[in-house]
Interface confidence: low
């Protein structure tokens, strides 16, 4: 790498992948192994992120860009740039500090992550319950009795029965 010749800031000519080395009379030196600089003119290279343990490498670090991590199977990313991995749960569960817990009666979660959400209240839209909700699925709302043509029989399903061994918390 050539010595930089900028009159204003001798470091401004150092390209990405290098740093302006004060210990070497401000020569542009390549980033050491396991470090990178994504922009020019940097006085140091940043340490590459290491995807270890519950993290795994999605993209290797290069001299100009940081490594990118995702999570090992059974975990999912949280936070900007997958800054943390959170344990997956089954559908019908949510993650608490004490591990995966079943959704309370009247709530559901159709994903392996996130929290249990209340079933849709069909009556708020003037509709009736067409298909009962479960821990894994929301209720399906059907047309309101008023929407049915005259003479058509409106069959309202029974109120959802509590699942065996699953009591509200």
């Amino acid at each position: 790498f050539e010595r930089t010749r900028s009159l204003q800031d001798p470091c401004s000519n150092c390209p990405a992948g290098t740093f302006c080395d004060n210990n070497r009379n401000q020569i542009c030196s390549p980033c050491p192994p396991n470090s990178f600089s994504s922009a020019g003119g940097q006085r140091t290279c940043d340490i590459c992120r290491q995807c270890k343990g519950v993290f795994r490498t999605r993209k290797e670090c290069s001299s100009t860009s940081n490594a990118e991590c995702d999570c090992t199977p059974g975990f999912h990313c949280l936070g900007a740039g997958c800054s943390m991995c959170e344990q997956d749960c089954k559908q019908g569960q949510e993650l608490t500090k004490k591990g995966c817990k079943d959704c309370c009666f009247g709530t559901f979660n159709d994903q392996k992550r996130g929290i249990c959400r209340p079933w849709t209240n069909c009556s708020l839209d003037g509709k009736s319950v067409l298909v009962n909700g479960t821990k894994e699925r929301d209720v399906v709302c059907g047309p309101s009795p008023a929407d049915l043509s005259p003479g058509a029989s409106s069959v309202t399903p029974p109120a959802p029965a509590r699942e065996p061994g699953h009591s509200p918390q």
Epitope: T44, D46, Q50, G53, V54, F75, M84, E86
Partner: antibody, heavy 123, light 107 residues
Framework: QVQLQQPGAELVRPGASVKLSCKAS????????INWVKQRPGQGLEWIGN????????NYNQKFKDRAKLTVDKSSSTAYMQLSSPTSEDSAVYYC????????????????WGQGTSVTVSS | DIQMTQSPASLSASVGETVTITCRAS??????LAWYQQKQGKSPQLLVY???TLAEGVPSRFSGSGSGTEYSLKINSLQPEDFGSYHC?????????FGGGTKLEIK
């Protein structure tokens, strides 16, 4: 609850090797990294290395790589650190530690610590 | 290796005072920093991780802050049980490294 049990003290002759033990209980031993940390009297902490019991994969601090050997016995849920050719500089308390709950952001912080083994190197 | 420089090495304070301990990393550690408390003759205990998250059971008078290379631990309204040594640790990269420690004594 998670426990890491270490003997209280070991007396070792200079040049003779010493093998320190750390018996884990209260969790699945093979699922969490075990670290070893050195603390000389009145001084700071130094990370020696760690081992993943499931496959015995190890990482070492280069400073200790030649003289520390980390192993595990899965059948007894015990981690070991063997220190070869000890000198007076190795007289210290040695802690075994366990990383935090996998899947949470504290994964690489040392959430659980043994009581430490005080090693005295003396003739 | 990432060097961790902790200051001050020791300080004296009175119960009820507020103190701040700082830790400087030789490179960007992106908040991968933990603080530990150690009482005389005891093992260290985790206080703070991810630079600012309090470990379970840690009183709210403790707080962590910082980013990049500069981090600090603040203890508001010191209690008698807070006296002892404090250590910072980076877990951004292997080898994991600790600061030199800060001994907090009663004035």
């Amino acid at each position: 609850q998670v426990q890491l049990q270490q003997p209280g003290a070991e007396l070792v002759r200079p040049g003779a090797s010493v093998k320190l033990s750390c018996k884990a209980s209260g969790y699945t031993f093979t699922s969490y990294w075990i670290n070893w940390v050195k603390q000389r009297p009145g001084q700071g902490l130094e990370w020696i290395g760690n081992i993943f019991p499931s496959d015995s994969y190890t990482n070492y601090n280069q400073k200790f790589k030649d003289r520390a050997k980390l192993t595990v016995d899965k059948s007894s849920s015990t981690a070991y650190m063997q220190l070869s050719s000890p000198t007076s500089e190795d007289s210290a308390v040695y802690y075994c530690t366990r990383f935090g709950s996998s899947g949470y952001p504290d994964y690489y912080t040392m959430e659980y610590w043994g009581q430490g083994t005080s090693v005295t190197v003396s003739s | 290796d990432i060097q961790m420089t902790q200051s001050p090495a020791s300080l004296s304070a009175s119960v009820g005072e507020t103190v701040t301990i700082t830790c400087r990393a030789s490179g960007n550690i992106d908040n991968y920093l933990a603080w530990y408390q150690q009482k005389q003759g005891k093992s260290p205990q985790l206080l703070v991780y991810n630079a600012k998250t309090l470990a379970e059971g840690v009183p709210s008078r403790f707080s962590g802050s910082g980013s990049g290379t500069e981090y600090s631990l603040k203890i508001n309204s010191l209690q008698p049980e807070d006296f002892g040594s404090y250590h910072c640790q980076q877990y951004w990269t292997i080898p994991y490294t600790f600061g030199g420690g800060t001994k907090l004594e009663i004035k």
